[in-house]
């Protein structure tokens, strides 16, 4: 039975040209995390394998940085980066847990972080 929950940074906003950290945290399970994938819509941005480490898609390597931890840093943000991001935790023996983050990239300098929320 899958007992874990993923806590994410929730709905967040950031300024155009700036950076943002996407973070997820898996809790309430003793399952071993074997890999975390970061996806935007249908695109795979990066993977972090427990043993082999980070592997960033060449399509995003200029604007994506690994970490902190299992999180992902997006740099040089554009309005086209607005949208849903997913952290996908591959675990053993539980299987797959998915967290969702919505990022809004704003033209203005008024960019506030949303509240944290949980996805069971």
């Amino acid at each position: 039975m899958m007992t874990g929950t993923i806590e994410t940074t929730g709905n967040i906003s950031a300024e155009k040209g700036g950076s943002i950290i996407l973070q997820c945290h898996l809790s309430s399970t003793t399952a071993q995390v074997t890999q975390v994938n970061w996806e935007q819509q249908d695109q795979l941005l990066a993977i972090c394998n427990a043993d082999l480490g980070w592997h960033i898609s060449p399509s995003f390597k200029d604007r994506v940085a690994p970490g902190p931890g299992l999180g992902l840093t997006l740099q040089s943000l554009t309005v086209n980066d607005t949208g849903e991001y997913f952290c996908i935790y591959h675990t053993y023996p539980d299987g797959t847990y998915t967290g969702r983050i919505f990022l809004e990239v704003l033209e203005s300098s008024v960019a506030e972080h949303g509240a944290r929320f949980q996805i069971p």
Epitope: N37, L44, I47, G53, H55, H90
Partner: antibody, heavy 114, light 107 residues
């Protein structure tokens, strides 16, 4: 130039043990996760084991769990695969592989037969 | 586990031909696919990673592409030295798995 040189293969009876080694050079060994991949005669490729750059985390294929152990000595730039309770189906060429499979050694042959 | 199916175990070609080697994933693996070439008596060599990026030193006649769960390695003009075994691999989900291989041979 990246070089991975495996050794330690040979003929062993079922139930026996072997320890494979992989000597790495031409790159910063301690910065890379490493793997062992095997290829049975006339067959495809199977990922057997992986190990973190620091050695603190490892993963083993279900087919070898409880029998094989992967380890490394970063001071010696060497990767190991300890194989116990060997079976006929473990007969294969074993390759040492860097990181996300970008460089492979030449392989060492393990034959399990009575 | 994700199954990578290379439906053609053998493909016949001629020097100068364009050939496409296919691999179907049992579920969506996005662009987390690599292709390897293995010549007789040698170890596999990485050709393509992240579905379409050529590894260092790989000739530009080799290209990789993806359409949903179908992944393709194309050789635009086959050379004699390209006759070999080709394997796909997914690294979207652990355990990482390989296709069964496709042997490219002369007609």
């Amino acid at each position: 130039e990246v070089q991975l040189v495996e050794s330690g293969g040979g003929l062993v009876q079922p139930g026996g043990s072997l320890r494979l080694s992989c000597a790495a050079s031409g790159f910063t060994f301690s910065s890379y996760g490493m793997s062992w991949v095997r290829q049975a005669p006339g067959k495809g490729l199977e990922l057997v084991a992986t190990i973190k750059s620091s050695g603190g985390s490892t993963n083993l294929a279900d087919s070898v769990k409880g029998r094989f152990t992967i380890s490394r000595d970063n001071s010696k730039n060497t990767l190991y695969l300890q194989m116990n309770s060997l079976r006929a189906e473990d007969t294969a060429v074993y390759y040492c592989v860097r990181g996300y499979f970008d460089y492979w050694g030449q392989g060492t042959t393990v034959t399990v037969s009575s | 586990d994700i199954v990578m199916t290379q439906s053609h175990k053998f493909m016949s070609t001629s020097v100068g031909d364009r050939v496409s080697i296919t691999c179907k994933a049992s579920q969506d693996v996005k662009t987390a696919v690599a292709w390897y070439q293995q010549k007789p008596g040698q170890s596999p060599k990485l050709l393509i990673y992240w579905s379409s990026t050529r590894h260092t030193g790989v000739p530009d006649r080799f290209t990789g592409s993806r359409s949903l769960t179908d992944h393709t390695l194309t050789i635009s003009s086959v050379q004699a030295e390209d006759l070999a075994l080709y394997y796909c691999q997914q690294y979207y989900s652990t355990p990482y798995t390989f296709g069964g291989g496709t042997k490219l041979e002369l007609k």
